[in-house]
Interface confidence: low
C-alpha cells in the first residue's frame, strides 16, 4: 500500500550535468543545458516528485511526473520507460507499482540519488546513450559504482 504525501518540483540531472526533460514526443531525454536553457525549457525540465508513505518501508517511495498540457507520470511497465498520461494517484493498493520508484541516496554521496523500480527489484533508472540521444532507461544494476544510475535532484520550490 502506498499513500500519497507531499510533492515537490525538481530538476533532475545525470552525473555529467545533463538535464532530464520530456521532448515533444513525450520521451525522457538528457541534454546539456545552461541554467537559462533549463528555465526556458520549463515545464519540460521541471518534474513533480510525489512522495508516498509505504506500508513496507524500503526507501522513499516516489512517482515522477511532468505537467505540459496534461500531467504525465513516469512508468516502467514491462521494464520500458515511458510517460503515461495520468495523475499520480492518492493511493496505490499494492506493494509494487510500475510508477513507484524508491529514491535513495548513494552510500557516501548524499547528494547523488538512485531510483529503484518497486516493480522490478534491482532495476534502476539510468542514462544510456543511443546514437546521438541520451535516454532515460530502466537498467539492472550490474556493477558497483555505476554512475549511469546516479542522478542529482535539485528542488525548485
Amino acid at each position: 500500500y502506498f499513500g500519497k504525501l507531499e510533492s515537490k518540483l525538481s530538476v533532475i540531472r545525470n552525473l555529467n550535468d545533463q538535464v532530464l526533460f520530456i521532448d515533444q514526443g513525450n520521451r525522457p531525454l538528457f541534454e546539456d543545458m545552461t541554467d537559462s536553457d533549463c528555465r526556458d525549457n520549463a515545464p519540460r525540465t521541471i518534474f513533480i516528485i510525489s512522495m508516498y508513505k509505504d506500508s513496507q518501508p524500503r526507501g522513499m517511495a516516489v512517482t515522477i511526473s511532468v505537467k505540459c498540457e496534461k500531467i504525465s507520470t513516469l512508468s516502467c511497465e514491462n521494464k520500458i520507460i515511458s510517460f503515461k498520461e495520468m495523475n499520480p494517484p492518492d493511493n496505490i493498493k499494492d506493494t509494487k507499482s510500475d510508477i513507484i520508484f524508491f529514491q535513495r541516496s548513494v552510500p557516501g554521496h548524499d547528494n547523488k540519488m538512485q531510483f529503484e523500480s518497486s516493480s522490478y527489484e534491482g532495476y534502476f533508472l539510468a542514462c544510456e546513450k543511443e546514437r546521438d540521444l541520451f535516454k532515460l532507461i530502466l537498467k539492472k544494476e550490474d556493477e558497483l559504482g555505476d554512475r549511469s544510475i546516479m542522478f542529482t535532484v535539485q528542488n525548485e520550490d
Epitope: 555529467n16 544510456e128 541520451f134
Partner: antibody, heavy 125, light 107 residues
Framework: QVQLQESGPGLVKPSETLSLTCTVS??????????WSWIRQPPGKGLEWIGS???????YYNPSLKGRVTISGDTSKNQFSLKLSSVTAADTAVYYC?????????????????WGRGTLVTVSS | DIQMTQSPSTLSASVGDRVTITCRAS??????LAWYQQKPGKAPKVLIY???TLESGVPSRFSGSGSGTEFTLTISSLQPDDFATYYC?????????FGQGTKLEIK
C-alpha cells in the same frame, strides 16, 4: 585543436603543498562533454591517475591520494589546477594534465585522449 | 582497486615483426580498456580505447582485442617509429588504473 599546458614550480619542499595549473587552449573547460584530469609518473615508473574534474565542479579523486588532493577549475581563465598537500619524496614525478571524454551508461570511454607535455616536480629540501 | 598486469615487461623485436602485448585485469572489466604508447620524455598517446576501437589518426597496424580479464595489443608489422613503452589502462571502475608498462626495444 585542443592543447594543454602544465605550469608550476619544479621544486617543492617536503610537507609543503604542490600546486600546478593546466591551461587549455582551443577548447573550453566549461563546455561539457569532458573531464579534465591529472595523471603523474614517477621517474622511470608507470602512470597513476590522480583525479578528474567535470565542468560542473564535480570532482573524482584516486582514493590513494584522497584527503591530500584538490582539483579545481577557473572557467574565466580556461584553466584547471591541482593541489597536493603534505608532499614527500614519493610525490616526485612528471605531472600531466589530460582531457577525458565523458561517458554515459553503456557508452563509457574513460581514457585520456589529449595530454599536456608534462612537468617534472621534485620534492626535496 | 583493479590491478592491471602487463606481459612481457620488455620485448625485443625487429622491424617487420608481428608483436603482441598482453594485459590482464585482476577482475572483469568488460571492454573498458585503453592502450597508450609513450616515447622517452613525451606524454603518452592513446592508440586504442574500449578494447578494440582505434583512435583517430592511429595507423591500422595497431589493433586491440579481448574482454573480461585478458586483453592484447597487436602490432601487425613493426615500424621504426613503434619502439616505445606501451601501457594499458582500465576504465571499468574508479580509480582508473594503468599497467606497469611494456618496453618494446630493437632486437
Amino acid at each position: 585543436q585542443v592543447q594543454l599546458q602544465e605550469s608550476g614550480p619544479g621544486l617543492v619542499k617536503p610537507s609543503e603543498t604542490l600546486s600546478l595549473t593546466c591551461t587549455v587552449s582551443g577548447g573550453s573547460i566549461s563546455a561539457g562533454g569532458y573531464y579534465w584530469s591529472w595523471i603523474r609518473q614517477p621517474p622511470g615508473k608507470g602512470l597513476e591517475w590522480i583525479g578528474s574534474l567535470y565542468y560542473s565542479g564535480s570532482t573524482y579523486y584516486n582514493p590513494s591520494l584522497k584527503g591530500r588532493v584538490t582539483i579545481s577549475g577557473d572557467t574565466s581563465k580556461n584553466q584547471f589546477s591541482l593541489k597536493l598537500s603534505s608532499v614527500t619524496a614519493a610525490d616526485t614525478a612528471v605531472y600531466y594534465c589530460a582531457r577525458t571524454p565523458a561517458y554515459f551508461g553503456q557508452d563509457r570511454t574513460d581514457f585520456f585522449d589529449v595530454w599536456g607535455r608534462g612537468t617534472l616536480v621534485t620534492v626535496s629540501s | 582497486d583493479i590491478q592491471m598486469t602487463q606481459s612481457p615487461s620488455t620485448l625485443s623485436a625487429s622491424v617487420g615483426d608481428r608483436v603482441t602485448i598482453t594485459c590482464r585485469a585482476s577482475q572483469g572489466i568488460s571492454s573498458w580498456l585503453a592502450w597508450y604508447q609513450q616515447k622517452p620524455g613525451k606524454a603518452p598517446k592513446v592508440l586504442i580505447y574500449k578494447a578494440s576501437t582505434l583512435e583517430s589518426g592511429v595507423p591500422s597496424r595497431f589493433s586491440g582485442s579481448g574482454s573480461g580479464t585478458e586483453f592484447t595489443l597487436t602490432i601487425s608489422s613493426l615500424q621504426p617509429d613503434d619502439f616505445a613503452t606501451y601501457y594499458c589502462q582500465q576504465s571499468h571502475h574508479p580509480p582508473w588504473t594503468f599497467g606497469q608498462g611494456t618496453k618494446l626495444e630493437i632486437k
